[in-house]
């Protein structure tokens, strides 16, 4: 997450390029949904606080078989620091909520959004 | 806080021309996209033109591309609209929206200015 | 294009439960933002992303969205709230886009 460190300076703060990317990808993956996303498959919810993106990874891995979230695991797996593998959980999973890979996406999309909202604020 | 000031309207025959400014204060200009949005008498909003924080991206609505153009001045904390070739049903009020950040995506007004009537007519 | 549609008016009485739809296709796919507009004056943005409220907005106005419907809910409707409302989203072909417009009476 240090990407988001210069978000504080003034003047013009382009996103960097990572996350606009990623979130771009959301954009795409939210807005191109002519069937239920991934078969309606269903992921762990997340806290979306920090360590987010690994905790993020770790529940989108364990959908198989999903081209629409593929380019996503991996810009994902840029942003986290250890390596990820299918059946890894964190603290951070809500564990006892399993929701539909379309909203955990939008949810993804809406948080890192207001993320950058709130950082060129400040 | 935030304000957007609109000026530039008045009549003008169909064929003729005028520019819009919109004078931005109380935020950081150059971290918003800013759009112009009119209202036809007795009528609905309708989305014109939005330019990116940074100039990089202007886009415009199919009724008015080819004859309007969107510029702005982050030194000056301004937007404008030339407007060519204006037809009747031009004629609205033409409204300066804040974006709600700096993405694409976050285009959507938050806050307007309080607008400035075109009128196209002979 | 991308295209909204909101019913030409709701009537509600005061107190009352008010609710405006706006449908389009995979709205609940976008994120969506409701306006509202009284005579003479610039529209005020009430909800942004679905359902969050600006500050200075009153708790009475919330918002969903899901599938292709949005919803505009105000409960315990105030005769203040007359006015008229648009639903707003982005889209990534039509970039902004409005629907119709919603004419709210409180009776």
């Known amino acids: 997450l240090t990407c988001l460190g210069g978000f504080a300076s003034p003047g013009p703060v382009p996103p960097s390029t990572a996350l606009r990317e990623l979130i771009e990808e959301l954009v795409n993956i939210t807005q191109n949904q002519k069937a239920p996303l991934c078969n309606g498959s269903m992921v762990w919810s997340i806290n979306l606080t920090a360590g987010m993106y690994c905790a993020a990874l770790e529940s989108l891995i364990n959908v198989s078989g999903c081209s629409a979230i593929e380019k996503t695991q991996r810009m994902l797996s840029g942003f986290c620091p250890h390596k990820v593998s299918a059946g890894q959980f964190s603290s951070l999973h809500v564990r006892d909520t399993k929701i539909e890979v379309a909203q955990f996406v939008k949810d993804l999309l809406l948080h890192l959004k207001k993320l950058f909202r709130e950082g060129q604020f400040n | 806080q935030v304000q957007l000031v609109e000026s530039g309207g008045g009549l003008v025959q169909p064929g003729g021309s005028l520019r819009l400014s919109c004078a931005a204060s109380?935020?950081?200009?150059?971290?918003?996209?800013i759009n112009w949005v009119r209202q036809a008498p007795g009528k609905g909003l309708e989305w014109v033109s939005g330019i990116a924080y940074d100039s990089s991206n202007t886009l415009y609505a199919d009724s008015v591309k080819g004859r309007f153009t969107i510029s702005r001045d982050n030194s000056k904390n301004t937007l404008y609209l030339q407007m060519n070739s204006l037809r009747a049903e031009d004629t609205a009020v033409y409204y300066c929206?804040?974006?709600?950040?700096?993405?694409?995506?976050?285009?959507?007004?938050?806050?307007w200015g309080q607008g400035t009537l075109v009128t196209v007519s002979s | 294009s991308y295209e909204l549609t909101q019913p030409p008016s709701v009537s509600v009485a005061p107190g009352q439960t008010a609710r405006i739809s706006c449908s389009g296709d995979n709205i609940g796919g976008t994120f969506v933002s409701w306006y509202q507009q009284k005579p003479g004056q610039a529209p005020v943005l009430v909800i942004y992303?679905?359902?969050d409220r600006p500050s200075g907005i009153p708790e009475r106005f919330s918002g969903s969205n899901s599938g292709n419907t949005a919803t505009l809910t105000i409960s315990g409707t105030q005769a203040e709230d007359e006015a008229d409302y648009y639903c707003g989203t982005w889209d990534m072909v039509t970039n902004n886009v409005f629907g119709g417009g919603t004419k709210l009476t409180v009776l």
């Open positions: 992303d679905d359902n």
């Open positions: 929206a804040r974006g709600l950040g700096a993405f694409h995506a976050d285009m959507q007004p938050d806050y």
């Open positions: 109380g935020f950081t200009f150059n971290s918003y996209w």
